[in-house]
C-alpha cells in the first residue's frame, strides 16, 4: 500500500476548499491538529478538520444526495406529470365533444325537446367529468337521472304534444313510469354498463398516473438519516481532512454506501415494477367498452336509438301512461 | 351500429378533413407512455448505481478513497476498509424504510390491486346479456371498433381517434351557442374529434 502523502503543513488548501462551502467562517485550523473531538472523519494522524467543519460537511453531503436523487428522477417525473396532464385534458375534450354531439343530435332530431334536453345532457356530462376526476358519484345514478329527466319532456313534447296545460304537471308520475314500464327498453342498462366500465378504467388510469407522480415526489424529497449523512461525509469529504483534495471515492465503496443510504427507497422497487406492469395490462384492456372515447363519443347515437325505441312504442305507452297518470294533480304554491 | 337519418343535418355541408397518415390516437399515446415507463421499470433498484455514476467516483485513477485512507482501486480495501469500526451497514438496512416510504408502498400496493382488478382480459366483447328486451342491438362482433347503440340499417362505426393535431381542426359549439343553426353533427363513416394537445416525448 502506498504511504499517505504528507498532510498540507498549513491546511491552506483545505481552507480554500472549505471557504467555498462556508464563506467567511474561521473553522479551519491554521495547521493540522489531533482532531480528538471528531466523530465522523476519525483521524489516523494530524487533521485539518474541526468538529464544526465535520457538521457542515454532513449537511452538505445530505444536500448533495438530495440533489442527486432529484436529478435522477427528473426525466421520469416529467414523463408522468406531462402525460397525466395531457390525458386529463384529452379526457375532458372527449367529454366536451360527447356532450356537443348529444346536444347536436337533440337539436337536429328533436328540437322540441331543447332547451330542457341541453340542460339534462349538460348535467349528465358534468357528472361524467367529475367522476373521471375522482368524485364519489354513482354512474347508475347519473344515467337514471338522465332518463328520468328526459322522459317527462319526451312524453309531453313528442308523444303527447296536445296535452292541455292542466295535465302538464305529471312529472312525478312520468318519472316513476319511466322505470316501471321500461319505456326506453334496455338502453339505459346498456348505457350504464358501457359508461360505468369505460369511466372506471379511465378514472383508475388517471389515479394511477397521479400516484406515480406522488411516488416520485416522495422519494424525490426524502430526508436522509444522520447515519447516512455520516457515511456520505466519510465518502465524499473526509479525504479533505488529510489534504487529499483531488482523490475520488472507490466505486465499490460508493455502491455499498448508496445501498446503505437507500435501503428504504429500494424497497419500493418490487411495487414499482408491479405498478408499471399492471398499468400496462390496464392500458392493453382499454378498448371497446373499456375505452371512454369510444363509448362517450357514441352515446349520442345510443340515446337517439333509445328515443326512437320510445317513439316506436308510443301508442301502447300513451294508453298505459294515460291510465297510470290520470290522477296526477297540479302542484300548489303553499 | 348507430343509424343516422339524412335529416340529422340542418347544414348539409360535409366537413372534409385532410387524411392524417399517422394519426395519434389516445390509445396509441397510452401505449407510447407505457413503453417509456417500461424503460424506467428498474428505476428504484438502479438508483444506488445511478447516483454513484453521477457523483465523483474514481474511474481511471489508480488510487481511490475508501473512507479511511487512500488505496489502490482494485485492492480488497477499496470497498471494505472504509466501513470498518464505523457504522453497521446491516443495522442501517434493518431499520426499514422511512414512514413516508412505507406509506407510499401501501398506496402502490393498493393501486396495483385496483389495476389488477380492473384489467380486462383481451378479446372481451360487449356484454351480450343486455339484450333481454329484444330490441335490435346490432350484433357487435370482434371488429376493431366496438359498435355502439343499435337500431336501423345505416351503420356507422365510432372510431377511437382523438387525434393530436397541430391545430384544432374541428370543434362543435353547441356548448356555447345552443341556438346556432350552423351546427354540425358526426356523419358518414366516422366520428373524429380533433385537438392540439402538444406532444410529450
Amino acid at each position: 500500500q502506498p504511504p499517505p502523502p504528507p498532510p498540507d503543513a498549513t491546511c491552506h488548501q483545505v481552507r480554500s476548499f472549505f471557504q467555498r462551502l462556508q464563506p467567511g467562517l474561521k473553522w479551519v485550523p491554521e495547521t493540522p491538529v489531533p482532531g480528538s473531538d471528531l466523530q465522523v472523519c476519525l483521524p489516523k494522524g494530524p487533521t485539518c478538520c474541526s468538529r464544526k467543519m465535520e457538521e457542515k460537511y454532513q449537511l452538505t453531503a445530505r444536500l448533495n444526495m438530495e440533489q442527486l436523487l432529484q436529478s435522477a428522477s427528473m426525466e421520469l417525473k416529467f414523463l408522468i406529470i406531462q402525460n397525466a396532464a395531457v390525458f386529463q385534458e384529452a379526457f375532458e375534450i372527449v367529454v366536451r365533444h360527447a356532450k356537443n354531439y348529444t346536444n347536436a343530435m337533440f337539436k337536429n332530431n328533436y328540437p322540441s325537446l331543447t332547451p330542457q334536453a341541453f340542460e339534462f345532457v349538460g348535467e349528465f356530462f358534468t357528472d361524467v367529468s367529475l367522476y373521471i376526476l375522482g368524485s364519489d358519484i354513482n354512474v347508475d345514478d347519473m344515467v337514471n337521472e338522465l332518463f328520468d329527466s328526459l322522459f317527462p319532456v319526451i312524453y309531453t313534447q313528442l308523444m303527447n304534444p296536445g296535452l292541455p296545460d292542466s295535465a302538464l304537471d305529471i312529472n312525478e308520475c312520468l318519472r316513476g313510469a319511466r322505470r316501471d314500464l321500461k319505456v326506453f327498453g334496455n338502453f339505459p342498462k346498456l348505457i350504464m354498463t358501457q359508461v360505468s366500465k369505460s369511466l372506471q378504467v379511465t378514472r383508475i388510469f388517471l389515479q394511477a398516473l397521479n400516484l406515480g407522480i406522488e411516488v416520485i415526489n416522495t422519494t424525490d424529497h426524502l430526508k436522509f438519516s444522520k447515519d447516512c449523512g455520516r457515511m456520505l461525509t466519510r465518502m465524499w469529504y473526509c479525504s479533505y481532512c488529510q489534504g487529499l483534495m483531488m482523490v475520488k471515492p472507490c466505486g465499490g465503496y460508493c455502491n455499498v454506501v448508496m445501498q446503505g443510504c437507500m435501503a428504504g427507497v429500494v424497497e419500493i422497487d418490487k411495487y414499482w415494477r408491479e405498478y408499471i406492469l399492471s398499468l400496462e395490462e390496464l392500458v392493453n384492456g382499454m378498448y371497446r367498452i373499456y375505452d371512454m372515447e369510444n363509448v362517450l363519443l357514441g352515446l349520442f347515437s345510443t340515446i337517439h336509438d333509445s328515443i326512437q325505441y320510445v317513439q316506436k312504442n308510443a301508442g301502447k305507452l300513451t294508453t298505459t301512461i294515460g291510465k297510470l297518470c290520470a290522477h296526477s294533480q297540479q302542484r300548489q304554491y303553499r | 351500429s348507430a343509424y343516422y337519418p339524412e335529416d340529422l343535418f340542418i347544414d348539409k355541408k360535409v366537413l372534409k378533413v385532410a387524411h392524417v397518415e399517422h394519426e395519434e390516437t389516445l390509445s396509441s399515446r397510452r401505449r407510447e407512455l407505457i413503453q417509456k415507463l417500461k424503460s424506467f421499470i428498474s428505476f428504484y433498484s438502479a438508483l444506488p448505481g445511478y447516483i454513484c455514476s453521477h457523483s465523483p467516483v474514481a474511474e481511471n485513477d489508480t488510487l481511490c478513497w475508501n473512507g479511511q485512507e487512500l488505496v489502490e482501486r482494485y485492492s480488497q480495501k477499496a470497498a471494505r476498509n472504509g466501513m470498518k469500526n464505523q457504522f453497521n451497514l446491516h443495522e442501517l438496512k434493518m431499520k426499514g424504510p422511512e414512514p413516508v416510504v412505507s406509506q407510499i408502498i401501501d398506496k402502490l400496493k393498493h393501486i396495483n390491486q385496483l389495476l389488477r382488478t380492473m384489467s380486462m382480459p383481451k378479446g372481451r366483447v360487449l356484454d351480450k346479456n343486455l339484450d333481454e328486451e329484444g330490441f335490435e342491438s346490432g350484433d357487435c362482433g370482434d371488429d376493431e371498433d366496438e359498435c355502439i347503440g343499435g337500431s336501423g340499417d345505416g351503420m356507422i362505426k365510432v372510431k377511437n381517434q382523438l387525434r393530436f393535431l397541430a391545430e384544432l381542426a374541428y370543434d362543435l359549439d353547441v356548448d356555447d351557442a345552443p341556438g346556432n343553426s350552423q351546427q354540425a353533427t358526426p356523419k358518414d363513416n366516422e366520428i373524429s374529434t380533433f385537438h392540439n394537445l402538444g406532444n410529450v416525448h
Epitope: F120, G122, E123, F125, T126, D127, S129, I137, N138, D140, D141, M142, N144, E145, D148, S149, E172, C173, R175, G176, R178, R179, D180 | -
Partner: antibody
C-alpha cells in the same frame, strides 16, 4: 299530490339512537332522492344527507360516522337514523324531496318536520 | 364548507312595498359547468320551508311572479316587487354547487 309525512319520537336519550321515518306519496322513491336537513336555533339549517333513487347515499362528512339513511321503495318509506345523539343534536329534522340534478339539486317539497330533543 | 351570509337579519316592510334580501357566499357558486346552484326558500311561521327560486332566477311551480332572483358568483338577491301578507316569514338562501349543501342564516320579513 306530492307529500312527505314524518314520524318519530320527540324525546331521545343519548344512549339511544335517533330514528325518524319519512313516508312519501304522490311520487315514487324509485325515481326521486330524499334529503334530510335539520334546523336548530344555534346552527340554523344544516344538510345531513340524501338517499338516491338507486339506494346510494351521500352524507355530510361531519356526521358520516353517525348517520344511516335507508329506504323501502315498496312502502314508500325512508328511514333516518343517527347513532349516539348528543344534546346539541336537538333540532327539528326535515326530510325533503330532491328536485334538480342529483347533488346539484334542491329540495322542492319538504316534510312537516320532527322536533327532536336529546336529553338524559 | 361554503358559508352563506344573509343581510339584513330582519326586514320590516309595509304591505305593497318592494323588499330586497341579499345573500353572499364565501366562495363562488359558479360551477365549472357554467351553472350556478343558488336557491331561495321561504319558511312561514310554524311551517316547513318552501322552495321559491332555484338556480338563481327560476321560479318554482306555483310561485307568483312578484318573486324574482338575481346575482352571480358570490352575490345574490331575492326581490319581492309588492309584498303581500302571505309572503311574511323567514327567507333562506342555499347553495348546492359545493358539497355539503349549506344555508344562509335567514332573513325575517315582517310588518313594520
Amino acid at each position: 299530490q306530492v307529500q312527505l309525512k314524518q314520524s318519530g319520537p320527540g324525546l331521545v336519550q343519548p344512549s339511544q339512537s335517533l330514528s325518524i321515518t319519512c313516508t312519501v306519496s304522490g311520487f315514487s322513491l324509485t325515481s326521486y332522492g330524499v334529503h334530510w336537513v335539520r334546523q336548530s336555533p344555534g346552527k340554523g339549517l344544516e344538510w345531513l344527507g340524501v338517499i338516491w333513487s338507486s339506494g346510494n347515499t351521500d352524507y355530510n362528512a361531519v356526521l358520516i360516522s353517525r348517520l344511516s339513511i335507508k329506504k323501502d321503495d315498496s312502502k314508500s318509506q325512508v328511514f333516518f337514523k343517527m347513532n349516539s345523539p348528543q344534546v346539541d343534536d336537538s333540532a327539528i329534522y326535515y326530510c325533503g324531496r330532491n328536485g334538480g340534478w342529483l347533488l346539484r339539486g334542491f329540495m322542492d317539497f319538504w316534510g312537516q318536520g320532527t322536533s327532536v330533543t336529546v336529553s338524559s | 364548507d361554503v358559508v352563506m351570509t344573509q343581510t339584513p337579519l330582519s326586514l320590516p316592510v309595509s304591505l305593497g312595498d318592494q323588499a330586497s334580501i341579499s345573500c353572499r357566499s364565501s366562495q363562488s357558486l359558479l360551477h365549472s359547468n357554467g351553472n350556478t346552484y343558488l336557491h331561495w326558500y321561504l319558511q312561514r311561521s310554524g311551517q316547513s320551508p318552501n322552495l321559491l327560486i332555484y338556480k338563481v332566477s327560476n321560479r318554482f311551480s306555483g310561485v307568483p311572479d312578484r318573486f324574482s332572483g338575481g346575482g352571480s358568483g358570490t352575490d345574490f338577491t331575492l326581490k319581492i316587487s309588492r309584498v303581500e301578507a302571505e309572503d311574511l316569514g323567514i327567507y333562506f338562501c342555499s347553495q348546492s354547487t359545493h358539497v355539503p349543501w349549506t344555508f344562509g342564516g335567514g332573513t325575517k320579513l315582517e310588518i313594520k
